[in-house]
């Protein structure tokens, strides 16, 4: 039975040209996290594998940095980066948990950043 829950940064906004941290946290389960996939729509951005390490998709490696933790840092943001992002936790023995983050990249310099998410 899957008892875990995913907490995410939720809906966030950031300025064009800036950077943002996408963060998820899996709680309320003792399942072992084997791998976390970060995806934008149907595109794989990055993989954080508990054993094998990080892999950033070649088409994103100039603008995506691993971490902090299991999170992902997006850099040099453009308005085209606006959209849904998913953290997909592959765990044993529970299975798959998915979290959703909506990022809006604004032209304005008055973009309100969502509260910074911290893993306890």
């Amino acid at each position: 039975m899957m008892t875990g829950t995913i907490e995410t940064t939720g809906n966030i906004s950031a300025e064009k040209g800036g950077s943002i941290i996408l963060q998820c946290h899996l709680s309320s389960t003792t399942a072992q996290v084997t791998q976390v996939n970060w995806e934008q729509q149907d595109q794989l951005l990055a993989i954080c594998n508990a054993d094998l390490g990080w892999h950033i998709s070649p088409s994103f490696k100039d603008r995506v940095a691993p971490g902090p933790g299991l999170g992902l840092t997006l850099q040099s943001l453009t308005v085209n980066d606006t959209g849904e992002y998913f953290c997909i936790y592959h765990t044993y023995p529970d299975g798959t948990y998915t979290g959703r983050i909506f990022l809006e990249v604004l032209e304005s310099s008055v973009a309100e950043h969502g509260a910074r998410f911290q893993i306890p």
């Epitope: 072992q32 791998q35 996939n37 594998n49 094998l52």
Partner: antibody, heavy 127, light 107 residues
Framework: EVQLVESGGGLVQPGGSLRLSCAAS????????MSWVRQAPGKGLEWVAN????????YYVDSVKGRFTISRDNAKNSLYLQMNSLRAEDTAVYYC????????????????????WGQGTLVTVSS | EIVLTQSPATLSLSPGERATLSCRAS??????LAWYQQKPGQAPRLLIY???KRATGIPARFSGSGSGTDFTLTISSLEPEDFAVYYC?????????FGGGTKVEIK
Amino acid sequence: EVQLVESGGGLVQPGGSLRLSCAASGFTFSSYGMSWVRQAPGKGLEWVANIKQDGSEKYYVDSVKGRFTISRDNAKNSLYLQMNSLRAEDTAVYYCARVSYYYDSSKLRWAEYFQHWGQGTLVTVSS
Amino acid sequence: EIVLTQSPATLSLSPGERATLSCRASQSVSSYLAWYQQKPGQAPRLLIYDASKRATGIPARFSGSGSGTDFTLTISSLEPEDFAVYYCQQVHNFPLTFGGGTKVEIK
């Protein structure tokens, strides 16, 4: 730190039996598949057997089917290889290896790689 | 059983040179291929998984490419510690199989 320590190797006569053990530490043993891989002196690597996390599925290379049995005791964090009807061609260093799982989202399946290995134990089958 | 054929059997090169190792599968293994390095008296070390992804702690001079039946491991500039035997392995299906190995030796 992941540690795998094999034991039980030695000299045995053709037709004899031997039981290898692999003591695991530094990780949650029951969450990982395990394998045995062997290497004959001066030769290449040969995968021998694999066992799933709960022991429910086992796979073997054809040359050892019916003679070797892979098993595990999750309470003892131990992997075993029972080798019967041993032949001269079974002479090798036997490594225990822990599976590292990689999920391929494009094909919706898991792949299993060997990230962690023991130091090996030598089995010599000779009269 | 999927047979993996590695070539060349031996590669004689000098430090600083580029090494290109080949692994050919008898049938498609998609991207389910790994490369390992083994030095005398030591257990193998995972270098590359999923054909092209570097495992944790592996230097950037090691790179893998290929899909289907033809794969390549490239060492862009050989360091003294890179002289060893390299094996490819398919994990597409059981039985898992290894190639015969390529020995990279100092010229």
